[in-house]
């Protein structure tokens, strides 16, 4: 069971300092941006991270949404990352959900975060290069200290 607590506006970056944004095709991508680029591209660079109280604290249960024309929420249904047009719900009466991720810190580095899917244990949000694009994907953790599954989250409120 997940009960919604509060939401924060955040900029999410990979460890190469590329900024996560949602493109015109609703795809989550990473791109090099200056701070002014990041501001100019808002609200596509500003993510609503909603925190949920988990009946079994396994990390901070969160949803990740973006508000362009409408609110869309990140989903990992069938292990495929996409934004679905929906508001983060107030309650989820289940222990798993395609839109809930466990946000966890890295010991000694409070600003480094990982996001594990609540639906698929051991699968994490990751940045992966595909041709010229840096995409947000769901990836099985497979190696020590994998930097591709680590992100920084900068609160904007």
């Amino acid at each position: 069971y997940f009960g919604k607590l509060e939401s924060k506006l955040s900029v999410i970056r990979n460890l190469n300092d590329q900024v996560l944004f949602i493109d015109q095709g609703n795809r989550p991508l990473f791109e090099d941006m200056t701070d002014s680029d990041c501001r100019d591209n808002a609200p596509r660079t500003i993510f609503i991270i909603s925190m949920y109280k988990d009946s079994q604290p396994r990390g901070m249960a969160v949803t990740i949404s973006v508000k362009c024309e409408k609110i869309s929420t990140l989903s990992c249904e069938n292990k495929i990352i996409s934004f679905k047009e929906m508001n983060p719900p107030d309650n989820i009466k289940d222990t798993k959900s395609d839109i809930i991720f466990f946000q966890r810190s890295v010991p000694g580095h409070d600003n480094k975060m990982q996001f594990e899917s609540s639906s698929y244990e051991g699968y994490f949000l990751a940045c992966e290069k595909e041709r010229d694009l840096f995409k947000l994907i769901l990836k099985k953790e497979d190696e020590l200290g994998d930097r591709s599954i680590m992100f920084t989250v900068q609160n904007e409120d």
Partner: antibody, heavy 120, light 107 residues
């Protein structure tokens, strides 16, 4: 740098209660867990329970359920552990330890420990 | 609760020795296991998390391996400052438990 500073040593009588405090500084308090871990003389580490201040409610190890109360005051970044119905076997060093963001999946910062002696 | 069993409970070794400590969980815990070092009169110190990831600042002679129920902490070449007690900790479920500890003493 995160620092956890605990209250001083206590001597208590059997049947009484003890309340130990843990003041955090240098980091985010509300979203990171604070746990209490005890260590009896010459014994191992025992997780008693913990709290994620933003959630408000604590989680307890089965062994201590009903006898321990863990609370947190976000305004002062202080966590508290109260243990009631004390017996001689509760004589131990009590540590507070800061855990991960929203959970108890590691302890990377520890307090200096508080010795609680239960003796008649 | 998940039970953690460490072996041996104590061992004697010399500087330069390779030391191996094992930890067994009563059920599968994936890679949700940490290792701590504790010296007398001091608080424990996190060495390794998620089974095999070295905490920053910890010497590379420490390594962890294993997944599921069986885990190992290895010190490749024991140094004088490594004589201490080592604990494993599982966090597969929100309620966390420690192993009973392994004391590494000077031979």
């Amino acid at each position: 740098q995160v620092q956890l500073v605990q209250s001083g040593a206590e001597v208590k009588k059997p049947g009484s209660s003890v309340k130990v405090s843990c003041k955090a500084s240098g980091g985010t308090f509300s979203t990171f867990s604070i746990s209490w871990v005890r260590q009896a003389p010459g014994q191992g580490l025992e997780w008693m329970g913990g709290i994620i201040p933003i959630f408000g409610t604590a989680n307890y190890a089965q062994k201590f359920q009903g006898r321990v109360t863990i609370t947190a005051d976000e305004s002062t970044s202080t966590a508290y552990m109260e243990l009631s119905s004390l017996r001689s076997e509760d004589t131990a060093v009590y540590y507070c330890a800061r855990g991960g963001y929203g959970g108890y999946y590691y302890f990377d910062y520890w307090g200096q420990g508080t010795l609680v002696t239960v003796s008649s | 609760d998940i039970q953690m069993t460490q072996s041996p409970s104590s061992l004697s070794a010399s500087v330069g020795d390779r030391v191996t400590i094992t930890c067994r969980a009563s059920q599968s815990i994936s890679n949700r296991l940490n290792w701590y070092q504790q010296k007398p009169g001091k608080a424990p110190k996190l060495l390794i998390y998620k089974g095999s990831t070295l905490q920053s600042g910890v010497p590379s002679r420490f390594s962890g391996s294993g997944s599921g129920t069986d885990f190992t902490l290895t010190i490749s070449s024991l140094q004088p400052e490594d004589f201490a007690t080592y604990y494993c900790q599982q966090h597969y479920v929100w309620s966390t438990t420690f192993g009973q500890g392994t004391k590494v003493e000077i031979k």
